[in-house]
């Protein structure tokens, strides 16, 4: 089974403001999985609709 994402490196602990960093294997770049109530590429915005 090929994983679609890896853990981000330690250097990226602050990459996501309110979320978890995942390194996308195919795109070869980091991305953020936002905590509940946050949105944005870096989970930097509070979700006003939540």
């Amino acid at each position: 089974v090929v994983s679609h994402f890896n853990d981000c490196p330690d250097s990226h602990t602050q990459f996501c403001f309110h979320g978890t960093c995942r390194f996308l294997v195919q795109e070869d770049k980091p991305a953020c999985v936002c905590h509940s109530g946050y949105v944005g590429a870096r989970c930097e915005h509070a979700d006003l609709l939540a």
Partner: antibody, heavy 115, light 106 residues
Framework: VQLQQSGAELVRPGASVKLSCTAS????????MHWVKQRPEQGLEWIGR????????KYAPKFQDKATITADTSSNTAYLQFSSLTSEDTAVYYC?????????WGQGTTLTVSS | IQMTQSSSSLSVSLGDRVTITCKAS??????LAWYQQKPGNAPRLLIS???NLKTGVPSRFSGSASGKDYTLSITSLQTEDVATYYC?????????FGGGTKLEIK
């Protein structure tokens, strides 16, 4: 997909200089951009990085007061600026972005500090 | 994180299988790159993620990982492979590089 760096610089001691690194084929906002130094006949040394999406920077301690890294997302370009240059700053400087499957390095900019 | 390349130089013969080793002082979870550099040239990225061969790099180059130990192998050394090789960790900041291993022909 590449990183294109500015041309060689010859500057006087005490002066300042700003080197550039323009990305094509990817968006610099996607990940951190880094700068690396290599003095003549020496190894490689990490200077620091920038998160182009928000301007946040991190530097190796020895470069904290020497280097300033900035980025302009509209031109997809990262910059490395030096102040109060000395002969110790004579080196080749590389910009780079690294992933797990791929990595990108500029061709390097030679900086010579000489009176 | 310290990266140690135990050999600063290796005396090799053309056609040899060459192994260059790099040891990390901490776990870096395969966030390791290998570079080839020839005098007057920029470092050339060979491998990222410990094992991923960059497009265009000959298949005689390969990378492997075992715990904190990383290896670059060249199956049959060619004249154009004579260079200095560096490892680099990019798991944590600051990024750190090994001191380099220079291949010299016997």
């Amino acid at each position: 997909v590449q990183l294109q760096q500015s041309g060689a610089e010859l500057v006087r001691p005490g002066a300042s200089v700003k080197l550039s690194c323009t990305a094509s084929g990817f968006n610099i906002k996607d990940d951190y951009m880094h700068w690396v130094k290599q003095r003549p006949e020496q190894g490689l040394e990490w200077i620091g990085r920038i998160d182009p999406a928000n301007g946040h920077t991190k530097y190796a301690p020895k470069f904290q007061d020497k280097a300033t890294i900035t980025a302009d997302t509209s031109s997809n370009t990262a910059y490395l600026q030096f102040s109060s240059l000395t002969s110790e700053d004579t080196a080749v400087y590389y910009c780079t972005r690294m992933g797990l499957r791929r990595g990108y390095w500029g061709q390097g900019t030679t900086l010579t500090v000489s009176s | 994180i310290q990266m140690t390349q135990s050999s600063s130089s290796l005396s090799v013969s053309l056609g040899d299988r060459v192994t260059i080793t790099c040891k990390a002082s901490e776990h870096i979870n395969s966030w390791l790159a290998w570079y080839q550099q020839k005098p007057g040239n920029a470092p050339r990225l060979l491998i990222s993620g410990a094992t991923n061969l960059k497009t265009g790099v000959p298949s005689r180059f390969s990378g492997s990982a075992s715990g904190k130990d990383y290896t670059l192998s060249i199956t049959s050394l060619q004249t154009e492979d004579v260079a200095t090789y560096y490892c680099q960790q990019y798991w944590g900041t600051p990024w750190t590089f090994g001191g380099g291993t220079k291949l010299e022909i016997k």
